[in-house]
């Protein structure tokens, strides 16, 4: 059955309640210089209205503080209102290493990111840090790497490993959850000139992730004791016509091309899914495509296999698919899939259908295919036009969390966290945020607060309290001081 009745119950005490933000652009200078200037000034208020320095007088300055960054103060205020336990954000690789290698490290950018993490920890909020977060509009690579063919060039994977190592070294004492790459399976939207570009770039992304994971495992895990994975875009697929065999096959093929493409080599075999490889090869043989999945060497298979500490999935919606034979040598046509928009379903302004049961099906599919491992939903959300009373978002959160709870309670999926997407929206972009682009709070925040404080959807009489050892102890005085801090 697609929909089952709501359940009452709670998530475990160590469940991560998170909120996700995309790339944080580092502020280059702290915006409160008044504390670092040792000079005394007299303000000529009635005359020329200028400040005149008083010579010979030097005041005591205070050291620079993280909250001097205006940007950080804003984020902390928003996070405090969210009442989350975890904050997922992404670093900007191009800002940290503008030359693409360790010859020029932007220490100020690293200091900024360290501040975001350490100030969050003061509020009892742990960070899940994403090292690389490409978007359709912005590949996010340092410029020199772009000029050398970006992800089509195997040396970009080595450059990524060096960058990851720097981040582990500089932030790893404070960060215990790492995502190497956000949605590498969606870079097909960018590397789309040919299927071979798509599969070549994907191959180098897989290698980049594996190199970073191996580096962490070897060099940093013993002391830092964190966990590293990568986030896959993981929408569920359903046959448009459940009575057509070809539609069922298309739905499974979608999952193979979208999720298994990256999951199989990392979680299971070290190689691409046999079904995907065979499907592309069969189209190649029939002259319908010149695409081919890269052949992996034994060394590459060994490198890739098992390089995840948990499964991280970004899930937003369920797609209705049907089979349609497509000619052409691009990833989109290699899949032979056509998407159908079901107009009877509740949908968002960007036409994301609200289909809560899809997330439960996804979680069961992942466990069935890749075994019983810790799973985090590292991004999940919907765009809602409302600037204050965002009812669609509240409905979405409630229903999707219900299905995640069913997966935990009934299906016994080891779900460890849910990260709502996203903290604040960007100007002239779809409205996914809990806060507007000018930091105004929406009513879905209270809804999410309530779910977090209840740890789900408890029975009337059940306690939502966890023992102090398991729950972060909140220091009320600290919180008060942080909020009052200039």
């Amino acid at each position: 059955k697609e929909s089952t009745p709501d359940v009452q119950g709670q998530f475990p005490c160590d469940f991560s309640w998170g909120v996700t933000e995309s790339v944080l652009k580092p502020e280059s200078v702290a915006s409160s210089p008044q504390f670092s200037d040792p000079h005394l000034y007299v303000w000529n208020a009635t005359g020329n209205r200028l400040l005149h320095r008083v010579e010979g007088v030097r005041l005591k300055t205070r050291p620079a503080q993280c909250t001097d960054f205006v940007n950080i103060k804003k984020q902390l205020e928003m996070l405090a209102r969210m009442k989350v336990t975890h904050y997922r954000f992404a670093l900007d690789w191009a800002s940290v290493l503008p030359t693409g290698n360790l010859s020029a490290v932007n220490r100020q950018a690293l200091r900024y990111y360290r501040c975001v993490v350490s100030e969050g920890l003061k509020l009892g909020i742990s960070a899940m840090v994403t090292l690389y977060y490409p978007t359709h509009a912005h590949l996010g690579l340092p410029e020199p790497l772009l000029h050398a063919d970006g992800w089509l060039n195997p040396s970009t994977a080595e450059a990524f490993q060096a960058y990851a190592g720097l981040c582990f070294q500089e932030l790893g004492d404070l960060v215990k959850l790492w995502i190497t790459i956000n949605e590498p399976n969606r870079l097909s939207d960018i590397y789309n000139r040919s299927g071979n570009d798509t599969y070549g770039a994907a191959h180098n992304l897989l290698v980049a992730h594996a190199l970073a994971w191996r580096l962490y495992d070897r060099q940093f895990r013993p002391s830092q004791r964190g966990a590293v994975s990568l986030s896959l875009h993981a929408d569920w697929a359903e046959p448009a016509n459940p009575y057509a065999d070809s539609h069922w096959r298309a739905a499974e093929r979608f999952l193979q091309f979208e999720i298994a493409w990256f999951a199989e080599p990392l979680f299971k075999t070290g190689d691409y899914p046999a079904a995907m490889r065979e499907y592309i090869a069969s189209k190649h043989r029939r002259g319908l495509s010149s695409s081919a999945l890269p052949r992996l060497t034994e060394a590459e298979r060994r490198l890739l296999k098992g390089t995840v500490d948990f499964c991280a999935l970004n899930h937003f919606t369920t797609r209705f698919v049907m089979h349609e034979q497509l000619a052409g040598s691009r990833y989109d046509s290699d899949r032979d899939i056509q998407f159908l928009q079901d107009i009877t379903r509740l949908s968002s302004p960007t036409r994301l259908a609200v289909i809560p049961w899809g997330v439960r099906k996804l979680l069961r599919w992942v466990r069935r295919n890749y075994g019983d491992m810790d799973i985090y939903i590292t991004a999940s959300g919907i765009d809602d036009q409302a600037l204050e009373d965002d009812r669609l978002r509240k409905y979405y959160l409630g229903k999707y969390l219900q299905e995640v709870l069913k997966a935990y309670l009934i299906d016994k999926v080891r779900i460890k966290g849910y990260y709502a997407f996203k903290l604040a929206e960007e100007k002239s972009k779809p409205r996914f945020g809990f806060f507007t682009s000018d930091f105004k709070a929406k009513s879905s925040i209270q809804f999410y607060n309530k779910v977090i404080s209840s740890r789900g959807f408890p029975f009337e009489n059940s306690s939502s309290r966890c023992s102090q050892t398991q729950e972060n102890t909140e220091c009320t005085v600290c919180l008060f001081l942080v909020q009052k801090k200039p």
Epitope: H147, A148, W151
Partner: antibody
Framework: EVQLQESGPGLVKPSQSLSLTCSVT?????????WNWIRQFPGNKLEWMGY???????NYNPFLKNRVSITRDTSKNQFFLKLNSVTTEDTATYYC???????????????WGQGTSVTVSS | DIVMTQSPSSMYASLGERVTISCKAS??????LSWFQQKPGKSPKTLIY???RLVDGVPSRFSGSGSGQDYSLTITSLEFGDVGLYYC?????????FGAGTKLKIE
């Protein structure tokens, strides 16, 4: 500022080889980009001849494939064009140009040399 | 090879006039098209890339449009310095191929 400068003989005899040099300043040819040779015939028609990439890989116009080769000297930051068995049809102005990588912020031809005129005549 | 058919081969236009030059590819080139200007005795200069993106420093009176197989370059208000040869180039596939050129003159 990136600059490209072509050099080579202005006159070549038929059946001989034409050799041109492109000297690049302001950017290392091993750091990135595709380094191309393009020629313009007397009637203004333009023809792409081939490229050598930042990593030394090259690609040629199939129309010229067995006659053309593009190589480089990374120590001098130069790349070269060699065209064998020339005929009068190869009389043209030869340009070296730089092309951005696909998927980069600028993926087209950006810098051109000023061109060098080559006449094939006995 | 992809064939680029450019039209017109030459044209006269008045100062201040709006000028449009067209290029048709023999197959879909997915916006991998650029436009060049060449003045007599000079090397070509790139004006537009990716069909509609203006190169830094190029006056905003130049604009590019189109997709699939059909593309055009527009000069909104012709100036005296705009005379010369204009070419389109497809770079979706190697070998790169050029249009035959349009000679633009002031009448």
């Amino acid at each position: 500022e990136v600059q490209l400068q072509e050099s080579g003989p202005g006159l070549v005899k038929p059946s001989q080889s034409l050799s041109l040099t492109c000297s690049v300043t302001g950017y290392s040819i091993t750091s990135g980009y595709y380094w191309n040779w393009i020629r313009q015939f007397p009637g203004n028609k333009l023809e792409w001849m081939g490229y050598i990439r930042y990593d030394g890989n090259s690609n040629y116009n199939p129309f010229l494939k067995n006659r053309v080769s593009i190589t480089r000297d990374t120590s001098k930051n130069q790349f070269f064009l060699k065209l064998n068995s020339v005929t009068t049809e190869d009389t043209a102005t030869y340009y070296c140009t730089r092309k951005g990588a696909y998927y980069s912020s600028f993926d087209a031809l950006d810098y051109w040399g000023q061109g060098t005129s080559v006449t094939v005549s006995s | 090879d992809i064939v680029m058919t450019q039209s017109p081969s030459s044209m006269y236009a008045s100062l201040g006039e709006r000028v449009t030059i067209s290029c048709k590819a023999s197959q879909d080139i997915r916006s991998y098209l650029s436009w060049f200007q060449q003045k007599p005795g000079k090397s070509p200069k790139t004006l537009i890339y990716r069909a509609n993106r203006l190169v830094d420093g190029v006056p905003s009176r130049f604009s590019g449009s189109g997709s699939g197989q059909d593309y055009s370059l527009t000069i909104t208000s012709l100036e005296f310095g705009d005379v010369g040869l204009y070419y389109c180039l497809q770079y979706d596939e190697f070998p790169l191929t050029f249009g035959a050129g349009t000679k633009l003159k002031i009448e």
